[in-house]
């Protein structure tokens, strides 16, 4: 079976790496812009400059392209704790990060959120905190791992998921409260 | 207590259009961006459109851009989702929600109210 192709990639097929058939004229193949740059008009004639123009402030195009318009530049998402690692320039996009000491998020492809790494008080750290990911804790005797933290076994109740690893003291716990029933 | 509450969901025909509200008490609605989030019959979460403190700052996720609407009334501490062009696909549960701050979870969303998308 031969994969469906758009048509935009079946007309830039016909043409050589770097050139792209001319809307207008299928005989035609013109020279991509280079990134950068968009398209302003077509080549006029085989062998023929494309007439491309730079991407004004505040877009850019990544690649070399037969866009009619850059593309505009994202911006840091403040309400996601988001901050700027470096800046939109032409012929790159603005690229978005976290602070020190705090990790991205993925709610989607394309929204991330940072977050504080989590410090593994009362356990130790197994993992460290990565760009992508939190650190992973193991906590100490008498405490569970409840949201990235470590919490006393005290705040277990036999409902969770934290009654195999705090099982003497839910067994302590429940003798307590068997003794003080008349 | 942080209390938030869904309304407005229902039956509605592909193509269609709702209007879903989410009142808010408990906290200082107006320091909080505020989320609308869905969760479609068998799926996890999907984040659909966020809302910074002063209605400025919006994110639409790409299955949403175009159709809905997220907007805030915070004289009123209500949340708002404007949902047209209704697709089957639109079919969840949808919940309103603090932006988390701790960590990825939401510490306090509400109920959720039904939107069934179908002819």
């Known amino acids: 079976l031969v994969p469906h192709l758009g048509d935009r990639e079946k007309r830039d097929s016909v043409c050589p790496q770097g050139k792209y058939i001319h809307p207008q004229n299928n005989s035609i193949c013109c020279t991509k812009c280079h990134k950068g740059t968009y398209l302003y008009n077509d080549c006029p004639g085989p062998g023929q400059d494309t007439d491309c123009r730079e991407c004004e402030s505040g877009s850019f195009t990544a690649s070399e392209n037969h866009l009619r318009h850059c593309l505009s530049c994202s911006k840091c998402r403040k309400e996601m704790g988001q901050v700027e690692i470096s800046s939109c320039t032409v012929d790159r996009d603005t690229v978005c990060g976290c602070r020190k000491n705090q990790y991205r998020h993925y709610w989607s492809e394309n929204l991330f959120q940072c977050f504080n790494c989590s410090l593994c008080l009362n356990g130790t750290v197994h993992l460290s905190c990565q760009e992508k990911q939190n650190t992973v804790c193991t906590c100490h005797a008498g405490f569970f791992l409840r949201e990235n933290e470590c919490v006393s076994c005290s705040n277990c109740k036999k409902s969770l998921e934290c009654t195999k690893l705090c099982l003497p003291q839910i067994e302590n716990v429940k003798g307590t409260e068997d003794s003080g029933t008349t | 207590e942080v209390q938030l509450m869904e309304s407005g969901g229902g039956l509605i025909q592909p193509g269609g259009s709702l209007r879903l509200s989410c009142a808010a008490s408990?906290?200082?609605?107006?320091?909080?961006?505020m989320v609308w989030v869905r969760q479609a019959p068998g799926k996890g979460l999907e984040w659909v459109s966020h809302i910074d403190r002063v209605g400025q700052d919006t994110y639409y996720a790409d299955s949403v851009k175009g159709r809905f609407t997220i907007s805030r009334d915070n004289s009123k501490n209500t949340l708002y989702l404007q949902m047209n062009s209704l697709r089957a696909e639109d079919t969840a549960v949808y919940y309103c929600a603090e932006l988390p701050k701790r960590g990825p979870w939401f510490d306090h969303r509400g109920q959720g109210t039904l939107v069934t998308v179908s002819s």
């Open positions: 408990g906290f200082t609605f107006a320091h909080e961006t």
